[in-house]
């Protein structure tokens, strides 16, 4: 899966929540960021994530589509210079400081099985998705397309009216 351009085709800020409306939050602890899945209090501000969308070509042996065989890759950045990374060895999702060009571990294939929710498939480990496990984000193996609808890998993106990226 090769990214077809070095620049994203679009970027926007959104807050990320689970299918059950828990918020994904990011906290700086001991000079590293921790990722939490939690219920926010009524007026608590949601953390925002910069989503950058990139076009990507299917590997030629995987699709008969030719130029038509495009998909969307996303990177997710909750704060400047930090991106979500897939740690496939530990089956974990981590926030790491990176410089561009970003490593493959920072790219996720975008899926939406429902019109109002999305899933993020690891670029470096096809069939493995960001999911929720024990109030944390983790990498979860999905063995068939039917299981793409399992709620623990579905996330909602809600628009934000703030245009800063803290």
């Amino acid at each position: 899966m090769s990214i077809t351009g070095i620049s994203p085709i679009t970027e926007y800020l959104a807050s990320l929540s689970t299918y059950n409306d828990q918020s994904i939050t990011f906290a700086l602890e001991d000079e590293s960021y921790e990722i939490y899945v939690e219920d926010l209090k009524k007026d608590e501000k949601k953390d925002k994530v910069l989503l950058s969308y990139y076009e990507s070509q299917h590997p030629s042996n995987e699709s008969g589509d030719g130029v038509d065989g495009k998909m969307l890759m996303v990177t997710l950045s909750p704060t400047k210079d930090f991106w979500l990374h897939a740690n496939n060895k530990e089956h974990s999702v981590e926030l790491h400081k990176s410089e561009k060009p970003l490593p493959d571990q920072a790219f996720f294939v975008l899926h939406n099985m429902h019109s109002n929710s999305v899933s993020f498939e690891s670029k470096t480990d096809p069939g493995v998705f960001i999911g929720v496990k024990d109030n944390h984000l983790a990498l979860i193996k999905v063995d068939s397309s039917e299981n793409l609808s399992t709620e623990n890998i579905l996330f909602k993106l809600s628009e934000t009216h703030h245009h800063h990226h803290h």
Partner: antibody, heavy 121, light 106 residues
Framework: EVQLVETGGGLVQPGRSLKLSCVAS????????MYWIRQAPGMGLEWVSS????????YYLDSVKGRFTISRNNAENTVYLQMNSLRSEDTATYYC??????????????WGQGTLVTVSS | DIQMTQSPSVLSASVGDRVTLSCKAS??????LDWYQQKVGEAPKLLIY???NLQTGIPSRFSGSGSGTDYTLTISSLQPEDVATYFC????????FGQGTKVEIK
């Protein structure tokens, strides 16, 4: 080369049923959301229905909910629109379209030539 | 539901003119906006996706811009073959077309 060929249109009386088919070729059908969009004579475009890659999730325009059913057969590269209880206001050219990207419901990357449905007594 | 409003309904311009078509959404659509061109007797075709990305094979005189609720399609130098109706379309929440802008040559 991507091709979408719609069939099944025609003249039908109000209250009757019609089933539209769209046969796809030139791309990996099971990777893409598929759609039906319609256009009444001399009017604009109106999204009618969507179905995700595996057919597990379907969406409809409010005015056709309960009357129209979208489905797909990935083995046969075909998407269907079953239209029941047809009304005169359903008269339109019905277009089949495919998603622009694999796996996502963003953009209509390619359209068929359409099939005309006329509902009249 | 998100409503999409296009203006003007009809635009008449001369060959070579720079023309601008407008599309306004009832809510923020996060740049999830396309433009489609439909010539008389033909199926629509995708011109621009995600606000400002030109579909393969579309001439570079077409460009898109915008954010939030306000979006624009610009034809930098109108050509006779650009006579068509242009529809904006949002997919941020559900799927909705604008009512179209018909572009004519004076």
């Amino acid at each position: 080369e991507v091709q979408l060929v719609e069939t099944g249109g025609g003249l039908v009386q109000p209250g009757r049923s019609l089933k539209l088919s769209c046969v796809a070729s030139g791309f990996t059908f099971s990777n893409y959301w598929m759609y039906w969009i319609r256009q009444a004579p001399g009017m604009g475009l109106e999204w009618v229905s969507s179905i995700n890659n595996d057919g597990g999730n379907t969406y409809y325009l409010d005015s056709v909910k309960g009357r129209f059913t979208i489905s797909r057969n990935n083995a046969e590269n075909t998407v269907y629109l079953q239209m029941n209880s047809l009304r005169s206001e359903d008269t339109a050219t019905y277009y089949c379209a495919k998603g622009h990207y694999s796996y996502t419901s963003y953009s209509f990357g390619y359209w068929g030539q359409g099939t005309l449905v006329t509902v009249s007594s | 539901d998100i409503q999409m409003t296009q203006s003007p309904s009809v635009l008449s311009a001369s060959v070579g003119d720079r023309v601008t078509l407008s599309c306004k959404a009832s809510h923020n659509i996060n740049k999830h906006l396309d433009w489609y061109q439909q010539k008389v007797g033909e199926a629509p075709k995708l011109l621009i996706y995600f606000t400002n990305n030109l579909q393969t094979g579309i001439p570079s005189r077409f460009s898109g811009s915008g954010s939030g609720t306000d979006y624009t399609l610009t034809i930098s130098s109108l050509q006779p073959e650009d006579v068509a109706t242009y529809f904006c379309f949002q997919y941020n929440s559900g799927w909705t077309f604008g009512q179209g802008t018909k572009v004519e040559i004076k």
